[in-house]
């Protein structure tokens, strides 16, 4: 904390300008009026204050606004945002998307910091849901943002927001998250025709159930192996050899390279070897001819 000393004669700041970069910390504390700083916050970011000087300016704002800064000040924090703690940010009420964008811009190119995570949390909670414009903004700055949310948090994403999602935004999502997002995507894209629909829904298919995969297999979609490998194992297992062949189209040849990996490995174990042989890929591990397959789970359900 900078000790309180009187401002030297002639150094009282009449406006926030470049001359202040020559002030020592104690001079900033003594000579810059907090109310002046608050009204001219938009100038601070353009002035190359050192991080130590920014500490002093933050201290002045903290004294002026002990209950949290007003949005008019928050919007113009610029580099001063980097000095804020999550505790500081929890006192804020950020409602404007422009404010959110301005602060995310300061942190651009860096990992999501605890400050940014807190800011986003405050913003989204204030809005009540992740609307399209917010999601657009967040994924533009942090492509992995969507996958950092819990399934519960994702449930507040309206289907209309799904249009903002790009394939790379889902790269780090796990199956639990895709289970929540897939039905929303299906709803969002329901009015599109076959090929366009597949292009849009493709990145969400890790949450698709068996019946939807069967339906896709009837539409000549030619799913690539990378997408197939991300499908839920439990959704792939009931598919027949013919259905997988239709689903993958010319990409079916890629199954050979993936035969030891899930879900291909588990799917192979469920197919008749005769049927697998029809693919001509040399896939091994299917059920030998003449063997009877009992579905014990079905038997238990009946008894």
């Amino acid at each position: 904390e900078v000790e309180k000393t009187a401002c030297p004669s002639g150094k009282k700041a009449r406006e926030i300008d470049e001359s202040l970069i020559f002030y020592k910390k104690w001079e900033l504390e003594a000579c810059v009026d907090a109310a002046l700083l608050a009204t001219q916050m938009d100038r601070v970011n353009a002035i190359p204050f050192t991080y130590e000087q920014l500490d002093v300016l933050k201290h002045k704002l903290d004294e002026l606004y002990p209950q949290g800064y007003p949005e008019s000040v928050i919007q113009h924090l610029g580099y001063l945002f980097l000095k804020m703690s999550p505790e500081d940010i929890r006192k804020w009420n950020v409602t404007s998307l422009e404010t959110l964008k301005a602060l995310l811009e300061v942190n651009k190119g860096h990992e999501m910091s605890p400050q940014v995570a807190t800011l986003i949390d405050r913003f989204v909670k204030g809005r009540g849901q992740l609307d399209k414009d917010t999601l657009d903004t967040l994924t533009a700055f942090y492509p992995g943002y969507l996958c950092s949310l819990s399934p519960e948090e994702l449930s507040s994403v309206p289907p209309s927001s799904i249009w903002a999602v790009r394939p790379q935004d889902l790269d780090t999502c796990d199956p639990r998250q895709l289970d929540v997002l897939y039905p929303k995507a299906r709803l969002a894209f329901q009015n599109m025709n076959g090929s366009e629909y597949f292009v849009k829904i493709q990145s969400f298919l890790g949450g698709a159930p068996t019946e939807d995969l069967k339906a896709l297999s009837q539409q000549n979609v030619s799913m690539d192996l990378a997408t197939f490998m991300k499908l839920r194992t439990d959704a792939v297992l009931p598919l027949t050899v013919a259905e997988v062949q239709k689903l993958l189209g010319p990409h079916v040849e890629g199954l050979k390279a993936e035969e030891r990996h899930r879900p291909v490995r588990d799917w192979i174990l469920r197919q008749r070897q005769d049927d697998l042989d029809t693919l001509g890929l040399g896939l091994q591990g299917g059920i030998p001819n003449g063997y009877l397959v009992l579905d014990l789970s079905m038997q238990e359900a009946l008894s």
Epitope: I21, P48, F49, T50, Y51, E52, L54, Y79
Partner: nanobody, 114 residues
Amino acid sequence: EVQIVESGGGSVQAGETLRLSCTASGFTFDDSDMGWYRQAPGDECELVSTISSDGSTNYADSVKGRFTISQDNAKNTVYLQMTSLKPEDTAIYSCRTMASRIGCWGQGTLVTVS
């Protein structure tokens, strides 16, 4: 990687002259505003002088009329010509891009005026 090397410091008598040099690499020098900072023993960091990419200069009140900042873009070097030195100019002098917002940090070059 941004690298900055300051040199030219030393011990002099009051009233004498020194010229500090700061050679930089790892960034576009002629697009950058540069500054000389100093920190005296037991005191806090202070900005002494700045030079912007267009060549305009600014000085702290305490050195106006005695210090001159200049740059040679071809050599990626900023200079601080210090005349009429006083004992209160004794400090470690550091050179920085203003955009770094770091101030007094790193090696610097020591100037001692007796």
